[in-house]
Amino acid sequence: FEIALPRESNITVLIKLGTPTLLAKPCYIVISKRHITMLSIKSGERIVFTFSCQSPENHFVIEIQKNIDCMSGPCPFGEVQLQPSTSLLPTLNRTFIWDVKAHKSIGLELQFSIPRLRQIGPGESCPDGVTHSISGRIDATVVRIGTFCSNGTVSRIKMQEGVKMALHLPWFHPRNVSGFSIANRSSIKRLCIIESVFEGEGSATLMSANYPEGFPEDELMTWQFVVPAHLRASVSFLNFNLSNCERKEERVEYYIPGSTTNPEVFKLEDKQPGNMAGNFNLSLQGCDQDAQSPGILRLQFQVLVQHPQNESNKIYVVDLSNERAMSLTIEPRPVKQSRKFVPGCFVCLESRTCSSNLTLTSGSKHKISFLCDDLTRLWMNVEKTISCTDHRYCQRKSYSLQVPSDILHLPVELHDFSWKLLVPKDRLSLVLVPAQKLQQHTHEKPCNTSFSYLVASAIPSQDLYFGSFCPGGSIKQIQVKQNISVTLRTFAPSFQQEASRQGLTVSFIPYFKEEGVFTVTPDTKSKVYLRTPNWDRGLPSLTSVSWNISVPRDQVACLTFFKERSGVVCQTGRAFMIIQEQRTRAEEIFSLDEDVLPKPSFHHHSFWVNISNCSPTSGKQLDLLFSVTLTPRTVDLT
């Protein structure tokens, strides 16, 4: 190889060891029998050398640095050449570095021809191995603007006081042009301006200077976004840190065409604007930091540009002004991430503050719109608390647990509507009365409706799940001892059509000691399946539950248990079951931890089934499943 650098070219070539391939033996640059691992060639020098190995690209890298001085004379503006030409260089990983020094008052603009650049974060690499590292200067301090790959949106970067651009090319890459030009501009009066051009839908992730380290103190950096007028842009902050400010405040400012309040100023922790039509600017302004404990300011954000959806022009009013203790959250439903570009899916408050999730609270009227290609990507979760603090005022008071029509009219599927029902301890209990009798969901008879009610204790220390219930069964009411949450969970979009079937009334009733009482009025046509609460995890220790089962005068009920033994093993106390005829008060008592469960039994009158648990040993829990079937009395049962 021969490298000859013209005099006055201000080019230095450095060949040095890269990261060695550990299993290989060292490779050397050989110059007239001398073996060396580093070779520096300066302007005006000509050097002939060879390598001592077959694959020097596995050992060495080459750096070609050109110093461009715009301080003492005119600047060579225009398209930047690769000098020396890549064809004259050994096939090593190459880094071309252009170091441009200019006066503070002169702006320098790097213009990137297509393909434009895409910024990458720490630890990321470019698929083709071609990277552009760009840094600027504040006095004597070097500031990293960022590292970029090809195929992005960044078209221009403006700086002042100098710029250092490093283009890294892998040894096998055929590229022989720099892909950028330098132009002079008037002073930009800030650290830098990055222009990002969108031709169509897409996204760009960008970072503050020096990211992930701190943005320089009291500096200003601007991003200019060029967006076709028919598209919409939304900004979301992926990662940010604030420093400790002594004077001024760290902030972002937006210049949004058409806005009457330009510049719009936001804190970094605010929701950032979305649904913006056309071009806009975003600026990051630092502050004077505390000298003792400066902290760091850094920002990584994403701009998503997409077609406005039909929904984005529709405003939905969610009137929660008459509601109390209620919150509504619209959020993305969990999905597997795909690698291809997925347009954003945002919900916007007052059409401008858009984010991927939004929580509305009671007491106000909210105007929302959607910026989303497919609203099935979102769902809605609502929580409402109904609490009674004064037992004298609440007793016998009833509340309808009904999803408000405002919510049902939104174009987003309702996932959960949870009512938290709170009562004063040991003073009142609750009764749930459905508009339509309920069926308990079991493996033997699953619910196939578009929604269910999930009933669970709302006492933090108590792990008690009564079960999942849907309309169309035999459970007439559910009484519970203390605080519970009732969640209406939807399973199909057809819930909108079936919404009329929902309806549950809760009443506050005098306190009782049992954890729960289910009132069951079986129909003659079907078998009723019932199971103990906390199925699969076992009825909690020392918990008692009852079923009040009605038997019509002309019917006989067959009570069947689906196991021979309960399987419970008691650590302390006894687990037992009482089956009691309501008319005669005659009762049978079974020791669940000792006896076998009763064989199918026939009941001519209404009866109680009461199950009380002991403190079981772990792994030997109490789970019981039983059924009740009605048959006409005329059938000979012998």
Partner: antibody
Framework: QVQLVQSGAEVKKPGSSVKVSCKAS????????MNWVRQAPGQGLEWIGW????????IYDPKFQGRATITADESTSTAYMELSSLRSEDTAVYYC?????????WGQGTLVTVSS | EIVLTQSPATLSLSPGERATLSCSAS?????LYWYQQKPGQAPRPWIY???NLASGVPARFSGSGSGTDFTLTISSLEPEDFAVYYC?????????FGGGTKVEIK
């Protein structure tokens, strides 16, 4: 397992030559530079030179150029170092070692005594 | 040629103490290698490529440095660490060794 076994101790007269051998096992000498160093009694290590068995290229410390000859026989995985015009100050333990970026395998050493 | 100067020539320390061995090059070196030698034995590879421990070398050893100044550090000396340590450069032939540092028991 990797080993470099050197030939036995030699006693030589001044002005004569000595040829020390170094047989490698457990690795391919083509993948290593085969170096020779020496250590005079109570002294430090002194690099003599190497051979690249892949292409038979050799390098010597200028101090030993013309007096030391390093060769290698790939077929027997053996490296040799011959030192001519011996003088009493050449009395030392001569070590061979194979080197790559990561691994360095050393022989046990051969004591060469030059005495009249 | 590149001259490597090791200092100190002798380091007298007690077990449990920290040892810092220095190797200074007369011109810039890409990587440095360290070897340990005990009396009557061949040198053993100890640190390769400036900072990587050779196989079997305890983690109390570390290597650092760049350019012309390199260091081998033993965080807490064990009895088996008392030996002579040599540095060697592979950046430019002849591939010289330092004069060695003897770490002896105080």
């Amino acid at each position: 397992q990797v080993q470099l076994v050197q030939s036995g101790a030699e006693v030589k007269k001044p002005g004569s030559s000595v040829k020390v051998s170094c047989k490698a096992s457990g690795f391919n000498i083509k993948d290593y530079y085969m170096n020779w160093v020496r250590q005079a009694p109570g002294q430090g290590l002194e690099w003599i030179g190497w051979i690249d068995p892949e292409n038979a290229n050799t390098i010597y410390d200028p101090k030993f150029q013309g007096r030391a000859t390093i060769t290698a026989d790939e077929s027997t995985s053996t490296a040799y170092m011959e030192l001519s015009s011996l003088r009493s100050e050449d009395t030392a333990v001569y070590y061979c070692y194979g080197s790559s970026y990561r691994f360095t395998y050393w022989g046990q050493g051969t004591l060469v005594t030059v005495s009249s | 040629e590149i001259v490597l100067t090791q200092s100190p020539a002798t380091l007298s320390l007690s077990p449990g103490e920290r040892a810092t061995l220095s190797c200074s090059a007369s011109s810039s070196v890409s990587y440095l290698y360290w070897y340990q030698q005990k009396p009557g034995q061949a040198p053993r590879p100890w640190i390769y490529l400036t900072s990587n421990l050779a196989s079997g070398v305890p983690a109390r050893f570390s290597g650092s440095g760049s350019g012309t100044d390199f260091t081998l550090t033993i965080s807490s000396l064990e009895p088996e660490d008392f030996a002579v340590y040599y540095c060697q450069q592979w950046s430019s032939n002849p591939f010289t060794f330092g004069g060695g540092t003897k770490v002896e028991i105080k």
